[in-house]
């Protein structure tokens, strides 16, 4: 994965500072907290299963 | 490089316990949810069990046909978690993986580890 | 419980030539955005290895011949061009809701 301040992450994912690695920003269905969810310009996240 | 360290396993009466235990190094182990997957050639995969991270208050989840006879639990000070697993039954044996999971799929695991429930 | 059936059971395939394996889920695992289907390998002796993440993202290290495709309910993992190194189960899974489950997984050889 990218290093913040290069390459910026693929389509589809955003950088976590908190996992130091570009993430899937389908994860934010699960968790919509996460700090790379910041990034993901997708719709708001469905309600997750639990 | 990211490691799953799997102890516990081996042979058990039908009715007994045995808890598995699982070290994690070579990712920031707190922030991911953590599972126990068995496999058998009846059943196949099987997911077993869940524990999620502190951001998630520790919930645990579990399948059904394990809940009120197994365990999960994790300590992040040392990168670790368990499977603690009562009155087991034949049906419970088979190859036992741990594994992390940010929140959708099984992207680490561990090597294995065989449980034989026979008299 | 979310049924996952893959097809075909096992599967032999001349190398080089492309293997198709079908998964389907007895309720969609879809929303709009993204499909929470997962491939894995697995190799006798070794755990399962991710391949295919979200239907169709191919996980770091895996080589550009695995590709996933599907939305809904009906999912595919292709392989072109198979090699001998592609000689495994594949398995589907899905991650939609609790409880997690896999497919029966599909047995490739190659020919």
């Known amino acids: 994965e990218q290093a913040p301040g290069t390459a910026p992450c693929s389509r589809g994912s955003s950088w976590s500072a908190d996992l130091d690695k570009c993430m899937d920003c389908a994860a934010c269905r699960a968790r919509p907290h996460s700090d790379f969810c910041l990034g993901c310009a997708a719709a708001p996240p469905a309600p997750f299963r639990l | 490089q990211v490691q799953l360290q799997q102890s516990g396993g081996g042979l058990v009466q039908p009715g007994g316990s045995m808890k598995l235990s699982c070290i994690a190094s070579?990712?920031?182990?707190?922030?991911?949810?953590m599972s126990w997957v068995r496999q058998s050639p009846e059943k196949g995969l099987e997911w077993v069990a869940e524990?999620?991270?502190?951001?998630?208050?520790?919930?645990?989840h579990y399948a059904e046909s394990v809940k009120g006879k197994f365990t999960i639990s994790r300590d992040d000070s040392k990168s670790r978690f368990f499977l603690q697993m009562n009155n087991l039954r034949a049906e419970d044996t088979g190859i036992y993986y741990c594994?992390?999971?940010?929140?959708?799929?099984?992207?680490?695991w561990g090597q294995g580890t065989d449980l034989t429930v026979s008299s | 419980d979310i049924v996952m059936t893959q097809t075909p059971a096992s599967l032999a395939v001349s190398l080089g030539q492309r293997a198709t394996i079908s998964c389907r889920a007895s309720?969609?695992?879809?929303?709009?955005?993204?499909?929470?289907m997962h491939w894995y390998q697995q190799k006798p002796g070794q755990p399962p290895k991710l391949l295919i993440k979200y239907a169709s993202s191919l996980e770091s290290g895996v080589p550009a011949r695995f590709s996933g495709s599907g939305s809904g309910t009906d999912f595919t993992l292709n392989i072109h061009p198979v090699e001998e190194d592609d000689t495994a189960t594949y398995y589907c899974q899905h991650s939609w809701e609790i409880p997690y489950t896999f497919g029966g997984g599909t047995k490739l050889e190659i020919k």
């Open positions: 594994s992390s999971t940010y929140a959708d799929y099984f992207h680490y």
């Open positions: 524990i999620r991270s502190k951001s998630d208050n520790y919930a645990t």
């Open positions: 070579g990712f920031t182990f707190s922030s991911y949810w």
């Open positions: 309720q969609s695992v879809s929303t709009s955005t993204y499909s929470y």
